[in-house]
């Protein structure tokens, strides 16, 4: 399990804000479900909570996770439940509210200050500030000027999809944003969460190619509903 604490990699060396609000509806990228970068500041309350049937976490909002409403209940009946706040018990990251992650069965803080760059990335389309200051160090985060002379090839860094060659889109890939191929039939894709809440995940995928849509994988029987794959399939 992810029992490690936020060490100096996480604190000092976050990916710089590369610009480009990737992962929003209508854009070329889709975020892979599961692990969110800490972010967001609205926490769902019981007052406005409306049960929503689900089969997996990605069908729920960022402030929710998919599970049986009763402890030890029928796994076949699952709804989107309000996320767990700090110091509450958890079994996986998705159960914890934004800004927290699951460590040793407890939701703990991810220290949002150190993730500010990632949060800002989803707010702005362009460089609001080309220096990011973390731990007192000022560092340039601009891309090489060569990026703008030729279209980016697969795997090269980008700011937005227009930086990439034909058949590629600009999508987050863990440390950075790179040009990735538009998805073909049978390839794993990401079904967007409800509420358009998919801007901060660490892996993003391009959209499915023409004539394809992202659907739950057929004949994909497994114990865990929460990690079923979606693939690009013919309409």
């Amino acid at each position: 399990t992810l029992n490690s604490v936020l060490n100096s990699n996480a604190i000092k060396n976050l990916p710089p804000p590369l610009g480009g609000a990737a992962g929003h509806p209508g854009s070329a990228v889709s975020a892979a479900p599961g692990i969110l970068y800490p972010g967001g500041n609205k926490y769902q309350t019981i007052d406005n909570y409306q049960p929503y049937p689900c089969a997996e976490d990605e069908e729920c909002g960022t402030d929710e996770y998919c599970a049986s409403p009763t402890r030890g209940g029928d796994a076949g009946v699952q709804i989107c439940l309000a996320c767990r706040k700090r110091r509450k018990r958890c079994m996986r990251h998705a159960m914890c509210c934004p800004g927290n992650y699951c460590k040793n069965g407890i939701c703990v803080s991810s220290d949002q200050n150190h993730f500010r760059g990632e949060i800002e990335e989803t707010i702005t389309e362009s460089f609001g500030n080309d220096h990011s200051t973390l731990d007192g160090y000022s560092r340039r985060t601009t891309l090489s000027s060569k990026m703008y002379h030729t279209k980016g090839q697969e795997g090269s860094v980008c700011l937005r999809s227009s930086d990439c060659a034909s058949g590629l889109c600009c999508a987050r890939h863990f440390w950075s944003k790179i040009c990735k191929p538009v998805l073909k039939e049978g390839q794993v894709c990401t079904k967007h969460r409800r509420k358009g809440s998919h801007g901060l995940e660490i892996f993003q995928r391009c959209y499915c190619g023409e004539g394809l849509s992202c659907r739950i994988q057929k004949d994909h029987h497994q114990a865990s509903n929460s990690s079923r794959l979606h693939t690009c399939q013919r309409h």
């Epitope: 992810l2 996986r92 060569k146 030729t150 440390w175 892996f203």
Partner: antibody, heavy 116, light 111 residues
Framework: QVQLVESGGGLVQPGGSLRLSCAAS????????MSWVRQAPGKGLEWVSV????????YYADSVKGRFTISRDNSKNTLYLQMNSLRAEDTAVYYC?????????WGQGTLVTVSS | DIALTQPASVSGSPGQSITISCTGT?????????VSWYQQHPGKAPKLMIY???NRPSGVSNRFSGSKSGNTASLTISGLQAEDEADYYC???????????FGGGTKLTVL
């Protein structure tokens, strides 16, 4: 075609230093993140470090943090790994790898032996 | 820490299909559906064979395919050939340590 050629490996005593280089060609070096991955004799692969295309971000494995420094010179299409305070357990073949969509191209590696 | 577990060895006869597993936890493989596979022949550099669960880079034979179910990712090689004999490694990322992680490797023997 993409080519990565490592150099600088050799025999060094515990506590010593070594600087590895990786000469890149066949692609726009300044547009890609680059990594070092090592493999101890008869063992599996271990990721060591990565550097962003413009050198603004660097990341390290816990096992080398504070001892190794990754850097690059885009004008020379070269990646570097400065290794200080070397230990016997750092003995390995060190590979330079392009980090496009994952580690999509690798060099042939350079052997670093730390022994007294 | 994230740990990806692979069988130490797998074997098969020419023409057969074999599957190599890579098991993580709900926090990594089961959580964010991302895994890659590398092939390494003795004395050679690793080669990317599969990325993002089931995508093949150009130049990789379609005999190699990837899949994932729950916390386990799999690499399947169909129509096994002598040149497939090599070590295979799965790889993912640790979002807490912001690092890349490799599985322990699986030695494939073609009988």
């Amino acid at each position: 075609q993409v080519q990565l050629v490592e150099s600088g490996g050799g025999l060094v005593q515990p506590g010593g230093s070594l600087r590895l280089s990786c000469a890149a060609s066949g692609f726009t070096f300044s547009s890609y993140w680059m990594s070092w991955v090592r493999q101890a004799p008869g063992k599996g692969l271990e990721w060591v470090s990565v550097i962003s295309s413009d050198s603004s971000s660097t990341y390290y494995a816990d096992s080398v943090k504070g001892r190794f420094t990754i850097s690059r010179d885009n004008s020379k299409n070269t990646l570097y790994l400065q290794m200080n305070s070397l230990r016997a357990e750092d003995t390995a073949v060190y590979y330079c790898a392009r980090h496009g969509i994952d580690f999509d191209h690798w060099g042939q590696g350079t052997l670093v032996t730390v022994s007294s | 820490d994230i740990a990806l577990t692979q069988p130490a060895s797998v074997s098969g006869s020419p023409g057969q299909s074999i599957t190599i597993s890579c098991t993580g936890t709900s926090s990594d493989l089961g959580g964010y559906n991302y895994v890659s596979w590398y092939q390494q022949h003795p004395g050679k550099a690793p080669k990317l064979m599969i990325y993002d669960v089931n995508n093949r880079p150009s130049g990789v034979s379609n005999r190699f395919s990837g899949s994932k179910s729950g916390n386990t990712a799999s690499l399947t090689i169909s129509g096994l050939q002598a040149e497939d004999e090599a070590d295979y490694y799965c790889q993912t990322y640790d979002q807490i340590k912001l690092s890349a992680v490799f599985g322990g490797g699986t030695k494939l023997t073609v009988l």
